[in-house]
């Protein structure tokens, strides 16, 4: 079948999800496409525990996640509710800063060097993290 029962080569399994950590940079939309071509999505952080796991693997490097407000409200790429979900913004962020001189504000979220989140210009070539969930069907215990 099409069930994903284990993580692909070079991906890291954690809490029934698979994660892939880039070592090169792309703009947010290009990173999003990269993940999609892997049948995955940019990482969606749903807990402090997941935050610490991702932070441990990326180190102190700006890294895209699957959170943006390019169409108005902040949205996670997999549909996870933003308002009620986990957040870890830096103080006074997101600020949609226009002072960078690159045109427009800041519509894409990334992990900063201390792991907390910031909104930034989506065209910046940051590293990124892809995530894909192991299928629920594969979580069923085997029949004895």
């Amino acid at each position: 079948g099409s069930e994903r029962t284990c993580c692909p080569v070079n991906w890291v399994e954690h809490e029934r999800s698979c994660y892939w950590f880039s070592r090169s940079g792309k703009a947010w939309a290009d990173a999003d496409n990269y993940c999609r071509l892997e049948d995955a999505h940019l990482v969606v952080v749903t807990s402090w525990e997941e935050q610490k796991f991702v932070q441990h693997h990326i180190g102190p490097v700006n890294t895209w996640m699957g959170l943006h407000d390019q169409n108005g409200p902040w949205k996670w790429v997999d549909g996870t509710d933003y308002e009620t979900g986990f957040k870890n913004w830096r103080p006074e962020q997101p600020d949609d800063w226009y002072g960078h001189g690159l045109g427009g504000g800041e519509d894409c979220a990334h992990f900063t060097d201390d792991g907390r989140w910031n909104d930034d210009v989506c065209q910046r070539p940051y590293r990124w993290v892809c995530e894909t969930e192991l299928d629920k069907a594969s979580q069923e215990p085997p029949l004895l």
């Epitope: 099409s2 090169s24 792309k26 703009a27 290009d30 999609r36 071509l37 892997e38 049948d39």
Partner: antibody, heavy 118, light 107 residues
């Protein structure tokens, strides 16, 4: 040994349709993105379309968007390209290629010629 | 779309020559670049990926370098089997795009 074998090319009138197939062997087909790349006679290479390993995501060049559809049947290790509303400028050799999300094409088929002419 | 421009469009060289061909991207693509070799009537063959990584089985006389917008493919000592057309390809952004090709001919 990785092998990719295209079929389905031929002569078709403008406005017509054609479906190309690419039979794959020698690797775990469902684990890799696949792509179509074309080359008009005497011209350079043009990326046409890509599809993720499990078929959940597809990507197209603007020149074929809305006319071509890429799909795959992992149970048959086969990649497809359904081409509708064909135009003279679609005349080319069509290659299927094993790729990945990084976009490098490490294995190619031998190509199949599509000629669109009245 | 990102435009890829190769130069020269053709080059005449002799066996044993050191030859360099270049590829320029219309915007920065970090190291998301590949090089292919194509011979008449045949499918392209991957030589270099990630700007400078040699594909398995490709002779070490081929090397790639560059990042950002400017890239080069170098033949340290041209061999008879190397006379072909070479294409660069960017995979930084969709649509993935190729250069127009550089034909390496026998002098």
């Amino acid at each position: 040994e990785v092998q990719l074998l295209e079929s389905g090319g031929g002569l078709v009138q403008p406005g017509g349709s054609l479906r190309l197939s690419c039979a794959a062997s020698g690797f775990t087909f469902s684990s890799y993105a696949m792509s179509w790349v074309r080359q008009a006679p005497g011209k350079g290479l043009e990326w046409v379309s890509s599809i993720s390993g499990r078929g959940g995501s597809t990507f197209y060049a603007d020149s074929v968007k809305g006319r071509f559809t890429v799909s795959r049947d992992n149970s048959k290790n086969t990649l497809y390209l359904q081409m509708n509303s064909l135009r003279a400028e679609d005349t080319a050799v069509y290659y299927c290629a094993k790729s990945n999300s990084s976009g490098w094409f490490d294995y190619w088929g031998q190509g199949t010629l599509v000629t669109v002419s009245s | 779309d990102i435009q890829m421009t190769q130069s020269p469009s053709s080059v005449s060289a002799s066996v044993g020559d050191r030859v360099t061909i270049t590829c320029r991207a219309s915007q920065g693509i970090t190291d998301w670049l590949a090089w292919y070799q194509q011979k008449p009537g045949k499918a392209p063959k991957l030589l270099i990926y990630a700007a400078s990584s040699l594909q398995s089985g490709v002779p070490s006389r081929f090397s790639g370098s560059g990042s950002g917008t400017d890239f080069t493919l170098t033949f340290s000592s041209l061999q008879p089997d190397d006379f072909a057309t070479y294409y660069c390809q960017q995979t930084n952004s969709f649509p993935w795009t190729f250069g127009q090709g550089t034909k390496v001919e026998i002098k």
